[in-house]
């Protein structure tokens, strides 16, 4: 399709992949004085975003309030049925009043019991809170300092005993590697020594003597 190709031609070229810089570059960047990097978002855009966020929050609050209203309505509709007085005579209405009064008394009783429980719970919470404050006063918290921690130590702290085996294995591997490199270094060193010995004064001397 012609339209599709022309659209594709108009599209901007994809940005090249970011160049991976050496750490030395970053070190220099950190140490050398440089201008403060300018924020990519303008003040007006920031304000716009803030307004948008507030709007969303407001809508969310309104929705929650509406949900609560609906929930209250549903709760009331299940507890308070619509009055069906049509066809009921004086006798029934009298009895209905008696029934409703009995129900109100029962609900009042339940409310009183619940209030008593709530009061008891509040008192208990207050007591426990006071105890917490008292205990906080007894033990001074040490000032925490930022500690440099190795990856191994962090692993140990996070994984506990399970990490110990893997760490030991890693340590062992490291050890073996170290020994091998040392051996190599020794051999290389000896060979260099021989070359130096032969090329230097001693070599000439040995050659002359021989």
């Amino acid at each position: 399709m012609a339209d599709g190709s022309s659209d594709a031609a108009r599209e901007p070229r994809p940005a090249p992949a970011p160049i991976r810089r050496r750490s030395s570059n970053y070190r220099a960047y950190a140490t050398e004085p440089h201008a403060k990097k300018k924020s990519k978002i303008s003040a007006s855009r920031k304000l716009q975003l803030k307004t948008l966020l507030l709007q969303i929050a407001k809508q969310e609050l309104e929705r929650e309030a509406e949900e609560r209203r609906g929930e209250k309505g549903r709760a009331l509709s299940t507890r308070c049925q619509p009055l069906e007085l049509a066809g009921l005579g004086f006798a029934e209405l009298q009895d209905l009043c008696r029934q409703l009064h009995a129900r109100v008394d029962k609900v009042d009783e339940e409310r009183y019991d619940i209030e008593a429980k709530v009061t008891k719970n509040i008192t208990e919470i207050a007591d426990l809170t006071q105890k917490i404050f008292d205990l906080r006063g007894k033990f001074k918290r040490p000032t925490l300092r930022r500690v440099r921690i190795s990856a191994d130590a962090m692993m140990q702290a996070l994984l506990g005993a399970r990490a110990k085996e893997s760490l030991d294995l890693r340590a062992h591997l490291k050890q073996v590697k170290k020994e091998d490199t040392e051996k190599e270094n020794r051999e290389v060193g000896d060979w260099r020594k021989n070359i130096d010995a032969l090329s230097g004064m001693e070599g000439r001397k040995k050659k002359f003597e021989s």
């Epitope: 004086f90 009298q94 209905l96």
Partner: antibody
Framework: EVQMVESGGGLLKPGGSLKLSCAAS????????MSWVRQTPEKRLEWVAT????????FYPDSVKGRFTISRDNAKNTLYLQMLSLRSEDTAMYYC??????????????WGQGSSVTVSS | DIQMTQTSSSLSASLGDRVTISCRAS??????LNWYQQKPDGTIKLLIY???RLHSGVSSRFSGSGSGTDYSLTISNLEQEDIATYFC????????TFDTGTKLELK
Amino acid sequence: EVQMVESGGGLLKPGGSLKLSCAASGFTYSNYAMSWVRQTPEKRLEWVATISSGGSYSFYPDSVKGRFTISRDNAKNTLYLQMLSLRSEDTAMYYCARRDNYFGSTFMDYWGQGSSVTVSS
Amino acid sequence: DIQMTQTSSSLSASLGDRVTISCRASQDITNYLNWYQQKPDGTIKLLIYYTSRLHSGVSSRFSGSGSGTDYSLTISNLEQEDIATYFCQQGHTIPLTFDTGTKLELK
């Protein structure tokens, strides 16, 4: 024509349970409160239960309170009476009746033919 | 509970007679009184409600009166089809109560 037809009666032992039904027709069932009235073998009439038009409220005499439950299905134009822990004194002809009132006076303006319930050991 | 009592459990009368059946309540029921007729086949019909109001389809030979605790049903010009048992019922207080009924017989 207003009509009520009861069904579900029978013979059972004390302590047993039974559910009576009453099919109503000829009027807007959901607009009326309904009642059950029984007639003892001695021909005494006893009001048993009343239910409001929508079924939210029900009324009973002390003699059946806690044992009998009146209910209704307005979609099916049917009235029910669930009877539990039946006693010999519950033996009677059970009538379904439409309830109405005038200036607060409560009355039953149309009655069914009745359904017989016998409780005997 | 309000007790309803009739002066007589049965009454004998001749066709064409004027018959009065009485009913008394144990307390003032402020005209909340109704009358029913039960035929020998067991069918029950409402005759009078609220002391004196005639139910639809009921013959004008039936009339009701009274106040407070004393009420009555009157049948003028008795006919064969009126031979039945008559009950009064108070609609003032729950439980709704009936009297024991008055059986009307031919002489």
